[in-house]
């Protein structure tokens, strides 16, 4: 017989992505005895849960946790039995269960009790369910995109830890109820609501971040359809022959068309609505989301909000990556500069259903709506943040890492579970998000 | 009621290529799409491509990418897939099928098949 | 590269229920498409939209799509059954269409 190394014990997190549109599960590992190194945590698995997202069960909370049971039964089997105990389990919900949380606050404390009760009775390490404020979810993205590109530390071939000189990168997140954009700063920010002061691996980071609630695809959608129900009579954005049966109850329940919503509307009314394969009038309809009219700060992105000039590059995640990728795959349409963005968002606004259909088969209804999608990409990142052709160049738009999906999620566990120290290697504490 | 007929079977030396094509008669290629799907001898079926014929518009399975090429000839209502640099691993029966919008542009309508043999 | 998982081979009793899935990642936010090959024979599409039927296709054929798994379902299952079943379904991401493995239904008495 002779000695074999055994291969090193490894440790396993849960966390929950409860989103407005949907929940996803990811299962992260990292070696036991590399707990504080950098760049050592991986996905191990993830789960969609079938379904809308835990806030599209505020009538039926234990709906809400019903869905989640699939998934929870597969971690079961994706994190090994010895390790179950020892597993720490998340949920984070985000902008849709914000925007619960403001127009029913009951509800939504009845699901998050509901999710909770059955998220304690599987055998991990539950460590709560809570709502992610957009300021969180702006830098746990972040930190998760920096973490998996390993810019904030590396070990050295001399077998030094060094803090690489590339810099950090700055992460955009376009959800379905909200969108973050978060980046490194020098200067401090006009508006402290708006700063983050982190320290990791013994390095001091200022990060702006805004998280712009009601600016995710999802309600950016439905703000469009109540705005061309109220100013058209027809649907600029969708494609000529394409129409549908609207129930106004659907557009005018969520909190980000309340200020469309009509004096006396019947909520169980429908309206035919077609699409005119207008992309003019369309990028006039997604200009009337942004206002720029005051700002009481030096600089302001839209809507009064202090932002400074975007610096450095920057990864673009979750529903920017699918705009842009869907305008680059399946529309075969270049879109490298923003010139090009705005171009192939143009092209795309100026296909009929039938063309659109042809072009990409086999998919749902919402093929409709990358116009407006892909316009409101390119009308936020030029206009709105103020991306110019050069800072343009320094996007990427991605949705992995290292095999590892790019969202709050897993900054969000490195923090919880300490697994970023604030000091550097060598010396072992947590992480200090002040 | 549109029929699509392809041309006969071929028997190719490795390093060559071969054209196949699908006629549709009874009908046109209007608002249709084409897609090529073949099937190794015993194997499962693998899409290789397809053409919108009405929209110029083609797309191609990345592992074909380079080596295959999908055309259409509207007035004579006839689509041709061209596979170049074949190897034994390409015998099998390339399909031609017609993507209609009445089912969002899946295959509704196949023909029997080409069998392409590659052999040296 | 997206893929889709189905079982090599199903067996049913004649005039029992036949279920075949397909599973994917977040499958059902997409269309789903049953195909079925008997030997020596072109595909014949069964089930479009996860759960319409083309004309002339029997009302024993149906589909379910939802989460990450996909699913044929042939009730009252006859000899004439027994054929080779593949899912399709189209991916975006890399602009293709997937098909599954391909399943092989036997119908047993």
């Known amino acids: 017989t002779r000695d074999v190394r055994e291969p090193p014990a490894l440790k396993y997190g849960i966390v929950l992505d409860a989103g407005s549109s949907h929940t996803s599960m990811f299962i992260y590992k990292w070696p036991a005895d590399k707990e504080n190194d950098t760049g050592i945590v991986g996905q191990h698995s993830s789960c969609d849960v079938p379904g809308g997202g835990i806030s599209s069960y505020a009538d039926n909370p234990s709906g809400a946790s019903q869905s989640l049971v699939g998934c929870l039964e597969q971690a079961l089997q994706d994190v090994p039995k010895e390790r179950h105990a020892g597993t720490p389990l998340y949920l984070g919900a985000t902008a849709g269960m914000r925007l619960l949380n403001l127009t029913n606050p009951e509800a939504s404390t009845s699901v998050l009790m509901a999710v909770t009760h059955t998220l304690t009775q599987y055998p991990f390490d539950f460590r709560g369910a809570r709502i992610l404020s957009g300021q969180e979810e702006g830098v746990f993205g972040w930190v998760t995109a920096n973490y998996l590109l390993e810019n904030f530390i590396k070990y050295g071939w001399v077998g030094r830890w060094f803090r690489p000189r590339k810099g950090t990168l700055g992460a955009m997140d376009l959800g379905g109820a909200s969108t973050q954009i978060t980046f490194e700063t020098t200067s401090p920010a006009e508006d402290r609501a708006s700063e983050v002061q982190l320290h990791l691996y013994g390095q001091h980071y200022r990060v702006y971040t805004h998280s712009f609630l009601c600016y995710g695809r999802d309600q950016v959608l439905q703000r469009l359809l109540a705005s061309a129900l109220q100013t058209h009579g027809f649907h600029p954005c969708w494609p000529r022959g394409f129409s549908t049966q609207v129930l106004l109850g659907d557009v005018y329940q969520s909190p980000c068309t309340m200020a469309q919503r009509p004096q006396n509307f019947n909520s169980s009314a429908r309206v035919s609505l077609s699409g005119s394969s207008d992309p003019h009038l369309c990028r006039d309809l997604v200009s009337g989301l942004f206002s720029f009219s005051s700002c009481p700060f030096s600089r302001c992105s839209f809507n009064g909000v202090f932002q400074p000039p975007v610096a450095g590059n920057f990864v673009a995640f979750s529903a920017f990556f699918y705009t842009v990728d869907f305008l680059r795959t399946s529309m075969g349409l270049p879109v490298a500069t923003l010139q090009q963005l705005e171009a192939a968002a143009v092209n795309v606004c100026n296909q009929t259903w039938a063309q659109l259909q042809a072009r990409v088969p086999g998919q749902r209804a919402r093929l409709a709506d990358y116009c407006a999608g892909a316009m409101f990409v390119q009308q936020l990142l030029s206009r709105g943040y103020g991306f110019d052709e050069r800072a343009f160049g320094g996007v990427i738009f991605q949705k992995k890492a290292a095999d590892t999906a790019v969202g709050w999620a897993l900054g969000y566990m490195l923090n919880l579970t300490n697994l970023i120290p604030a000091d550097p290697p060598g010396l072992r504490k947590g992480t200090d998000f002040s | 009621q549109v029929q699509l007929v392809q041309s006969g079977a071929e028997v190719k030396k490795p390093g060559s290529s071969v054209k196949v094509s699908c006629k549709a008669s009874g009908g046109t290629f209007d608002s249709y799409a084409v897609s090529w799907v073949r099937q190794a001898p015993g194997q499962g079926l693998e899409w290789m491509g397809r053409i919108v014929p009405w929209l110029g518009h083609t797309q191609y399975a990345q592992k074909f990418q380079g080596r295959v090429t999908i055309t259409a000839d509207e007035s004579t209502s006839t689509a041709y897939m061209e596979l170049s640099s074949l190897r034994s691993e390409d015998t099998a029966v390339y399909y031609c099928?017609?993507?209609?919008?009445?089912?969002?542009?899946?295959?509704?309508?196949w023909d029997q098949g080409t069998l392409v043999t590659v052999s040296s | 590269s997206y893929e889709l998982t189905q079982p090599l081979s199903v067996s049913v009793a004649l005039g029992q229920t036949a279920r075949i899935t397909c599973s994917g990642d977040?499958?059902?936010?997409?269309?789903v498409y049953w195909y079925q090959q008997k030997p020596g024979q072109a595909p014949v599409l069964v089930i479009y939209d996860d759960n319409n039927r083309p004309s002339g296709i029997p009302e024993r054929f149906s589909g379910s799509n939802s989460g990450n798994t996909a699913t044929l379902t042939i009730s009252r299952a006859q000899a004439g059954d027994e054929a080779d079943y593949y899912c399709a379904s189209y991916d975006l991401q890399q602009a293709r269409w997937v098909f599954g493995g391909g399943t092989k239904l036997t119908v047993l008495g």
């Open positions: 977040a499958i059902g936010e997409k269309y």
């Open positions: 099928a017609r993507e209609s919008p009445g089912y969002r542009y899946s295959f509704d309508v």
